[in-house]
Amino acid sequence: KKKEKVKKGSECSEWTWGPCTPSSKDCGMGFREGTCGAQTQRVHCKVPCNWKKEFGADCKYKFESWGACDGSTGTKARQGTLKKARYNAQCQETIRVTKPCTSKTKSKTKAKKGKGKD
């Protein structure tokens, strides 16, 4: 039965697969979910422990400085360009992240606290 299901699903023109999510901890055996139209599949997969140790995160980005505060949304943004990806991770080449603007005092405290982390 299991084979039939996989075979039937494979007739779908293009499956989109999510990341391999280990069942426990951050590596080892787990599951990956795939979708194709209305069809879904859940397959066993394995995150090699050496890869997780090497990277910790699937996608690493290098970020610009935060932009000016956008008064209309109350947020500021910055762009990140891909620095390194786990071999099988389908990472975006650029990403944009936003965060709420804070008052000057708050910003100063935050900057001191989070030095080197942004």
């Epitope: 779908c12 391999c20 990956r32 795939g34 394995k46 090699p48 360009t81 620095k83 390194k84 990806a85």
Partner: antibody, heavy 117, light 107 residues
Amino acid sequence: QVQLVQSGAEVKKPGHSVKVSCKASGQSFSSYWMNWVRQAPGQGLEWIGMIHPSDSETILNQKFKDKATLTVDISTSTAYMELSSPRSEDTAVYYCSSWSAKRGDFWGQGTLVTVSS
Amino acid sequence: EIVLTQSPATLSLSPGERANLSCRASESISNNLHWYQQKPHQAPRLLIKYASQSISGIPARFSGSGPGTDFNLTISSVEPEDFAVYYCQQSNSWPLTFGGGTKLEIK
């Protein structure tokens, strides 16, 4: 689009090391894994190893751990593969390829290395 | 290391026919399987990544299936330019490995 241009064919005597270069142009060189693959005459493809230009992290096929050294020069967007003490069985076409799981890969044109006395 | 076994070693077809190429992995590799085409004196060209994901610029007649241990590359209607050697490659674990290849030749 990434373009990879490899150095020209080499003829070496056994035991004389050889260094193949792979120069990238186009999209960011430093963001993607650079693979090295070889193909002996009339044979299939064999993976040598890979290096990530951002931090020079290298993963080598154990078969090549004492044979191949992978390096990168970020300033010139060039990857290198050096074969130490090559023997006649190392005669092959050596390819570099830049891998992105999202977009796929781009290959160099290949470099024929002939090891002969 | 993961061993990939390709079959058949040689496939003889006429243009217009359907081609089915198989690649079997020695253990489950999820969908971490890629297909390449190689013509004489050329570098390999990626056709399908991650078992079934299409590649920009590759004709729609090429499709792939998986995941698990049994994978297939299908060419719905073979064109004259498709006669070449086809390799599968796994990226599930080190070392990355290739299958021995299937030669698609004109009947």
